[in-house]
């Protein structure tokens, strides 16, 4: 029951997870004109991954694609594709993990495949968080910087005449989208990779006890060969009941009246 | 069409206070702000200010910020500006216009104009 | 505030001629987001209240006449009359519609020769 929740919880949390990467990536407002110990202009400006947006006094906004790919800083194609990676890794790991929850049944599907399919989703889910919250942070590093650079070069005076006001940006909103959706991608990863821990089905590891008889005497040996653990063919019908916890040190074999010819 | 008609003029005494008027009609009155501007006499244009009806924002300028109150009332789709302490300074003609959209903050619609006379 | 110089202050011209009046801001009007100049041109004539003929430093108002023509950029601005008519004689305003508080140019009035 505990697992099912946890496997439930896990696809719930990843799914608004992705739900907020995927917003995040088309938002417009990834950088947003800094108002403060700035001139305060009758025009707001912002801009996203794929457009920029000017908004006047009025109301009235107008937004400009990048329609160049040549021409975008690398820095931004990279978080383009970061964002991107990680919603289509989100996406697969949202499909595969509907096949894998356990309060759904799919023909004779075996809990040792719904296991695997649930760590999958799970490091999927990881890997796509992850991609979210480097593509947010590298663009927040990029704005930082960009920011020092500007407030530095804030008047760039035109022979000491005419001053020009630089536009100086701060963080937009998407980045805290972004950086929340991502790490909730991240818990329902984790959250996924723990139910499949109990998803698992159990097998022995069962203690080999070895004799050799050398002509008529027979020499009982402790501690011989351990048992396969689940991926020979011999394992079809093997059971662990300590679930691998202990070394072989740990636990002694003793005869039983199985041992013996 | 859109028009503004401004209150008539105003013959007040110093150190007292005036109250004009702006009515919008012809428009959808919240969506648009309403700009208030000043011309002295034989003078330029200034701006004082501008309120937004719907929000009731208001954005002033800093020489006029102590002078002046703007106001707005949706239901009468009327803009108010207050004119506080009166001197010969504050004698001229008070426009209120609109801001149009997608002007470019240019201001599309103006009133005809309140006359204001400080004098004792 | 940004100061907004026009010149000259006043031109006497002749119908059909060509008048071109100049604007400059101290601050640079354009905005990068759009790249945009957030200079406002506008005519008022005697006892009338100011109209609306250029935004954008050159997108003509509706039901302007196409002999206005505004331009340039930055802070450096001009307005071009390709053929004066008797009812265009008037005084000429320029407006930084780019920062608060807004604010015009002392103007340029127009009089016949």
């Known amino acids: 029951m505990a697992v099912t929740a946890c496997q439930g919880l896990g696809f719930v949390v990843s799914l608004i997870g992705i739900a907020g990467i995927i917003a995040a990536t088309c938002m417009d407002q990834w950088s947003t004109q800094d108002l403060y110990n700035n001139p305060v202009t009758a025009v707001f400006n912002y801009q996203g991954l794929w457009r920029s947006c000017v908004r006047e006094s009025s109301g009235f906004t107008e937004c400009r694609g990048y329609f160049t790919l040549l021409g975008l800083p690398a820095m931004l194609q990279a978080v383009r594709a970061l964002m991107i990676v990680g919603i289509v890794l989100g996406a697969i790991g949202l499909l595969v993990s509907i096949f894998a929850l356990k309060c759904i049944r799919i023909g004779s599907m075996e809990d040792s495949a719904k296991a695997n399919m649930t760590l999958t989703s799970g490091i999927m889910f990881i890997v796509s968080g992850l991609c979210a919250i480097a593509g947010v942070s590298v663009f927040a590093n990029m704005l930082v910087t960009n920011f020092w650079m500007s407030t530095a070069n804030m008047y760039t005076g035109m022979g000491g005449m005419v001053q020009t006001v630089q536009t100086r940006y701060t963080f937009g909103a998407a980045l805290f989208v972004g950086w929340v959706a991502g790490g909730l991608t991240l818990i329902g990863g984790v959250m996924m990779c723990i139910a499949c821990r109990g998803l698992a089905p159990e097998e022995t590891n069962y203690k080999a006890v070895s004799y050799h008889a050398s002509g008529h005497s027979v020499a009982y040996k402790p501690g011989g060969f351990k048992a396969s653990t689940g991926f020979g063919s011999n394992t079809k019908n093997k059971k662990i009941y300590d679930g691998g916890a202990r070394t072989e040190d740990e636990v002694q074999s003793y005869p039983s009246k199985h041992d013996y010819v | 069409q859109v028009q503004l008609q401004q209150s008539g003029a105003e013959l007040a005494r110093p150190g007292a206070s005036v109250k004009m008027s702006c009515k919008a009609s012809?428009?959808?009155?919240?969506?648009?702000?309403i700009h208030w501007l000043k011309q002295g006499p034989g003078q330029g244009l200034e701006w004082i200010g501008y309120i937004n009806p719907n929000t009731i924002y208001t954005n002033y300028n800093q020489k006029f910020k102590y002078k002046t109150t703007l106001t707005a009332d949706k239901s009468s789709s009327t803009a108010y500006i207050q004119l506080s302490s009166l001197t010969s300074d504050d004698s001229a003609v008070y426009y209120c216009?609109?801001?149009?959209?997608?002007?470019?903050?240019?201001?599309?619609?103006w009133g005809q104009g309140t006359s204001v006379t400080v004098s004792s | 505030d940004i100061v907004m110089t026009q010149s000259p202050s006043s031109q006497t011209v002749t119908a059909g001629e060509k008048v071109t009046l100049s604007c400059r801001s101290s601050?640079?009007?354009?905005?990068?987001?759009?790249?945009?100049?957030?200079l406002t041109w506008y005519q008022q004539k005697p006892g009338q209240p100011p109209k609306l003929l250029i935004y954008w430093a050159s997108t003509r108002e509706s039901g302007v006449p196409d002999r206005f023509t505004g331009s340039g950029s930055g802070t450096y601005f001009t307005f071009t009359i390709s053929s004066v008519q008797a009812e265009d004689l008037a005084v000429y305003y320029c407006?930084?519609?780019?920062?608060?508080?807004?604010?015009f140019g002392a103007g340029t009035k127009l009089e016949l020769k």
């Open positions: 601050q640079s009007l354009l905005n990068g987001g759009n790249q945009k100049n957030y």
């Open positions: 407006q930084n519609a780019y920062f608060y508080p807004f604010t």
């Open positions: 012809g428009y959808t009155f919240p969506t648009y702000s």
């Open positions: 216009a609109r801001e149009g959209y997608g002007r470019g903050n240019a201001m599309d619609y």
